[in-house]
Amino acid sequence: HTAAQDNCTCPTNKMTVCSPDGPGGRCQCRALGSGVAVDCSTLTSKCLLLKARMSAPKNARTLVRPNEHALVDNDGLYDPDCDPEGRFKARQCNQTSVCWCVNSVGVRRTDKGDLSLRCDELVRTHHILIDLRHRPTASAFNHSDLDAELRRLFRERYRLHPKFVAAVHYEQPTIQIELRQNTSQKAAGDVDIGDAAYYFERDVKGESLFQGRGGLDLRVRGEPLQVERTLIYYLDEIPPKFSMKRLT
């Protein structure tokens, strides 16, 4: 069941082209931009989603303080190179032969260089901190209810097992969701925390990647939780390598 058979669409990725040309006339879907066949029973990798996006027509105290190695995606969109499995290639280059190394969520982790730049391995992002600010509400959300609903959301909408949602912190109006997933913890078939975080980010922005599924409607005890802003920090298994000049 890689895709919905009846009308041949991809429930988990609207940025696909689907046709009944799979084995035995089964519905098969390919990501826009790369043409890679995707498994529509799970999330599509962030690399393939970014590639599809680039190919689309142009029209406080209890809170966690990200450590000094935390990365924020300040570079914005780029057209990535993905490997055959849909993962980011460790080295990314643009059309002007400027290259840099990225982590498993595609965020730059070195200074930019030229074509001689070497990126020995794709470094895994094992800890993601999603920092949200919610719109004002009459009263603060109950922390345990908020925790339960966010874990349920990640489990049911993004198919991320609750064991990978390490913690939910809340200090009104700031919510922090910590996702943790070491290489050794991730079994075959497990959704990657980077992919789940990207789908969540797009959902929060009102740009859902799901096909025919409603937008994000997050409620805690019936009270709507509306997000005003999102900031995502990425921590890699190996700290990033930036020169001192970037830090000044």
Epitope: H1, P11, S41, A148, E149, R152, R155, E156, H161, P162
Partner: antibody, heavy 120, light 110 residues
Framework: QEQLKESGGGLVQPGGSLKLSCKAS????????VSWVRQAPGKGLEWIAY????????YYATWVNGRFTISSHNAQNTLYLQLNSLTAADTATYFC?????????????WGPGTLVTVSS | DVVMTQTPASVEVAVGGTVTIKCQAS??????LAWYQQKPGQPPKQLIY???TLASGVSSRFSGSGYGAEFTLTISGVECADAATYYC????????????FGGGSEVVVK
């Protein structure tokens, strides 16, 4: 061997309370979610509540309306269901059921059940 | 709220025959469906999960199919031991749910 065993059932008067237990053995409680499901005599299965013990996240069927409370004691690998304001309609066999450890909520391990009878 | 509707409520089948039980979800649940068998005085036993995957130790005479909102449990080469009540269950969500289980289908073996 992985097992679940319920206890605490019995005869209780209408309006009374009861606390059911479910003891898990042979597996680590923290890696799974567990539900309480009940079955009235001659009727179908009715889901009551679910808990993910590692984080004490709890979820209830819409009809529960605060009368029942699910909880766990992780160190003792034990699940509880507190039943309050009982009526004759709550007479049933109460089962605990463990999920398969995957992202969906399918239950691959069940206890034998404990019978609760509400009668004066 | 996802509501599960099972048909038929009861079905008679001869030994060696084939029986089909249907389960309909009120909303799309993808392939998040499980089937259980329950005999009198016993707890339910999981037969199938993810709509079509056979649970460990379950006979291959049992098969599940379907996706989205319509699902089927088929028992082929029915044996006397298959006399039981069968339940479907949506396994997608526990949010705003009244009951994830279907009403049950009794299989009587002649």
């Amino acid at each position: 061997q992985e097992q679940l065993k319920e206890s605490g059932g019995g005869l209780v008067q209408p309006g009374g309370s009861l606390k059911l237990s479910c003891k898990a053995s042979g597996f680590d409680f923290n890696n799974y979610g567990v539900s309480w499901v009940r079955q009235a005599p001659g009727k179908g299965l009715e889901w009551i509540a679910y808990i993910y013990p590692a984080f004490h996240n709890t979820y209830y069927a819409t009809w529960v309306n605060g009368r029942f409370t699910i909880s766990s004691h992780n160190a003792q690998n034990t699940l509880y269901l507190q039943l309050n304001s009982l009526t004759a309609a709550d007479t049933a066999t109460y089962f605990c059921a463990r999920d398969a450890g995957s992202v969906d909520y399918n239950f691959n391990l069940w206890g034998p059940g404990t019978l609760v009878t509400v009668s004066s | 709220d996802v509501v599960m509707t099972q048909t038929p409520a009861s079905v008679e089948v001869a030994v060696g025959g084939t029986v089909t039980i249907k389960c309909q979800a009120s909303k799309n649940i993808d392939s998040n469906l499980a089937w259980y068998q329950q005999k009198p005085g016993q707890p339910p036993k999981q037969l199938i999960y993810a709509a079509s995957t056979l649970a460990s130790g379950v006979s291959s005479r049992f098969s599940g199919s379907g996706y989205g909102a319509e699902f089927t449990l088929t028992i082929s080469g029915v044996e006397c031991a298959d006399a039981a009540t069968y339940y479907c269950q949506q396994a997608l969500t526990i949010g705003n749910v009244d009951n994830p289980f279907g009403g049950g289908s009794e299989v009587v073996v002649k």
